[in-house]
Interface confidence: medium
Amino acid sequence: KKNPCNAEFQNFCIHGECKYIEHLEAVTCKCQQEYFGERCGEKDLLA
């Protein structure tokens, strides 16, 4: 099965890297520093 991060979820993560967790069939984001949220779209104002 192809990695959805390279297809339909290619632009899913705004400030982070798309990760596909194969054993859960789940697309998630690993955020850049200072960013958080499902798509790494929220900025941590305390950082």
Epitope: K1, I21, H23, L24, E25, A26, C29, C31, F36, C40
Partner: antibody, heavy 124, light 112 residues
């Protein structure tokens, strides 16, 4: 609001079968792995099964492997647990639980929301 | 399978006093870059379990800051800085680093 409502529990004889259901609402069901956890009377929690978002991968402890089958219908926002060859030791409250993810700058999967449970009694 | 051992089994506390629960795993729960999959759940009498702490020390949504988690590797602790009446119940640690996922036996917090 995340809601998980289990049903299908009841009294069954040893060797019998039962199918539990969990109706999910308040979130995009198809995006979340799901689990079943049980609690025997006056005992602790025991993980029973987990299923991936699309249902391709399923996981069980040895205590139920080969007897229980987890499945899901994403179109119906529903999770199921088919229980066969039931034993007295399967008597428990069965909880349906959502598997994260919780985002804190990186994904992390945990059983973040649980249903109220449905009671299964295996007795002759 | 990873065995999760909690202590004490029962914890009688005075309202307003601190409380501490220990959880030890039979092997390390560190999972590479993904962190440590150690969680704490609270089960109040007659209710279903609720997620309290995830990833060792992160409080879940709506959890009061009197609850804190700490630890690493195989040794973990849940602390309640000042116990309130609503904190009565059973607390479970749980690991989801390795299948099968396993829970500790539980610690019953009650008011003296």
């Amino acid at each position: 609001e995340v809601q998980l409502v289990e049903s299908g529990g009841g009294l069954v004889k040893p060797g019998g079968s039962l199918r539990l259901s969990c109706a999910a609402s308040g979130f995009t069901f198809s995006s979340y792995p799901m689990s079943w956890v049980r609690q025997a009377p006056e005992k602790g929690l025991e993980w029973v099964s987990t299923i991936s978002t699309g249902g391709r991968y399923t996981y069980y402890p040895d205590s139920v492997k080969g007897r229980f089958t987890i499945s899901r219908d994403n179109a119906k926002n529903s999770l199921y647990l088919q229980m066969n060859s039931l034993r007295a030791e399967d008597t428990a409250v069965y909880y349906c639980a959502r598997q994260g993810p919780i985002y804190y700058g990186n994904y992390y999967y945990a059983m973040d929301y649980w249903g109220q449970g449905t009671t299964v009694t295996v007795s002759s | 399978d990873i065995v999760m051992t909690q202590s004490p089994l029962s914890l009688p506390v005075t309202l307003g006093d601190p409380a501490s629960i220990s959880c030890r795993s039979s092997q390390s729960l560190v999972d590479g870059e993904d962190g440590t999959y150690l969680n704490w759940f609270q089960q109040r009498p007659g209710q279903s379990p609720k997620l309290l702490i995830y990833k060792v020390s992160e409080r879940f949504d709506g959890v009061p800051d009197r609850f804190s988690g700490s630890g690493s590797g195989t040794d973990f602790t849940l602390k309640i800085s000042r116990v309130e009446a609503e904190d009565v119940g059973v607390y479970y640690c749980s690991q989801s680093t390795h299948v099968p996922y396993t829970f500790g036996g539980g610690t019953k917090v009650e008011i003296k």
